[in-house]
């Protein structure tokens, strides 16, 4: 399988909720010996290797933001720690998984990375990355919503 990002750029007015999404495409290994771990972190745009630097999201590290399961099982956590920081993690049966940042501020702007680790008994682990940029516009009216797009094209969609 591989990890894709439906949108590479999210532009949100301050105060909105931003839901950033990654998607596992292709067949996920099935079987009793397969475990999938998913997590999120902030990184830097100017790196040779994207997503190699790992910075916390609202003071929560990628180890705090692990979602964990076998295959395409759904998982959803409203862990106290994440909730208190205005974050929510979700994952569905179709390979989509997301992080929601509530009430975004310009300080939330940056390059967000999702990491998927596939562990199989007696196999080396496999790691897949996705990245997307969040731009939070200061002082914009609370009536407007987040816009998600791919930077290379002009199509955009209103995001949650």
């Amino acid at each position: 399988f591989k990890v894709t990002t439906p949108y590479s750029l999210y532009v949100c007015p301050e105060g909105q909720n931003a839901t950033l999404t990654c998607r596992i495409l292709g067949p996920v290994s099935k079987g009793h010996d397969v475990t999938i771990y998913k997590t999120w972190y902030l990184s830097s745009r100017g790196e040779v290797q994207m997503c190699s630097e790992r910075r916390p999201i609202r003071n929560l590290t990628f180890q705090d933001l692990h979602l964990h399961h076998g295959g395409h099982q759904a998982a959803n956590t409203s862990h106290d720690l994440a909730q208190r920081h205005g974050l929510e993690l979700a994952s569905d049966h179709h390979g989509n998984f997301s992080i929601t940042l509530r009430n975004v501020t310009p300080r939330d702007s940056g390059l967000y990375c999702c990491l998927v680790i596939e562990l199989k008994n007696h196999h080396p682990e496999q790691r897949f990355y996705g990245s997307m940029e969040l731009q939070v516009q200061a002082g914009k009216g609370s009536g407007s919503t987040c816009m998600a797009s791919n930077e290379q094209d002009s199509d955009s969609i209103t995001a949650a």
């Epitope: 180890q63 998982a75 956590t77 862990h79």
Partner: antibody, heavy 117, light 107 residues
Framework: QVQLQQSGAELVRPGVSVKISCKGS????????MHWVKQSHAKSLEWIGL????????TYNHKFKGKATMTVDKSSRTAYMELARLTSEDSAIYYC??????????WGQGTSVTASS | NIAMTQTPKFLLVSAGDRVTITCKAS??????IAWYQQKPGQSPRLLIY???NRYTGVPDRFTGSGYGTDFTFTISTVQAEDLAVYFC?????????FGGGTKLEIK
């Protein structure tokens, strides 16, 4: 194959300190936090704390603050826990357990610590 | 601290029986509950996470359910090798806490 290999049993005099280790193999050590758990007959399982193996930050159960100190050595893929000023109350089996999501998915074999004169 | 009250403490059952263990949290823990099995002389082993997800390699006779404060762990058809102590654990907030354990014995 993911494994957590803990150091051997410790029999020590009351009042001294002991440092036990937990070496991770078969996975990227710094991708997962490490929990420490105490198991005694009296108290079943008690969570001591959690260390972030990437940043080195530790979160303690307030009950074990001043008693346990967790550290990590990334280069040797090893987590450590030092127990200070041992008393008979500290005699127990101590486990390290890998943090994954909201669970502890792999556990070490346990280290027995006995404080006795 | 969130207290996890696990019942019963002991279960004596026959192979083939259905077994249910309950865990009650002193406040809501959402679905941040895991269940572990500890066989005699061994380390605990993860069976269920996020309250109802079966961990890799765990037989489907083990199931978990619940949300908020009330959680249930079920073994649909007990087998001789299920002799063990079973623990629930909340990971919703620190300090993480465990139930007192349920010792399952086979007649």
């Amino acid at each position: 194959q993911v494994q957590l290999q803990q150091s051997g049993a410790e029999l020590v005099r009351p009042g001294v300190s002991v440092k036990i280790s937990c070496k991770g193999s078969g996975y990227t050590f710094t991708d997962y936090g490490m929990h420490w758990v105490k198991q005694s007959h009296a108290k079943s399982l008690e969570w001591i704390g959690l260390i972030d193996t990437y940043y080195g930050d530790a979160t303690y159960n307030h009950k074990f603050k001043g008693k346990a100190t967790m550290t990590v050595d990334k280069s040797s893929r090893t987590a450590y826990m030092e127990l200070a000023r041992l008393t008979s109350e500290d005699s127990a089996i101590y486990y390290c357990a890998r943090r994954a999501g909201n669970a502890m998915d792999y556990w070490g074999q346990g280290t027995s610590v006995t404080a006795s004169s | 601290n969130i207290a996890m009250t696990q019942t019963p403490k002991f279960l004596l059952v026959s192979a083939g029986d259905r077994v249910t263990i309950t865990c009650k949290a002193s406040q809501s823990v959402s679905n941040d509950i895991a269940w572990y099995q500890q066989k005699p002389g061994q380390s605990p082993r993860l069976l269920i996470y996020y309250a109802s997800n079966r961990y890799t390699g765990v037989p489907d006779r083990f199931t978990g359910s619940g949300y908020g404060t009330d959680f249930t762990f079920t073994i649909s058809t007990v087998q001789a090798e299920d002799l063990a102590v079973y623990f629930c654990q909340q990971d919703y907030s620190s300090p993480r806490t465990f139930g007192g354990g349920t010792k399952l014995e086979i007649k």
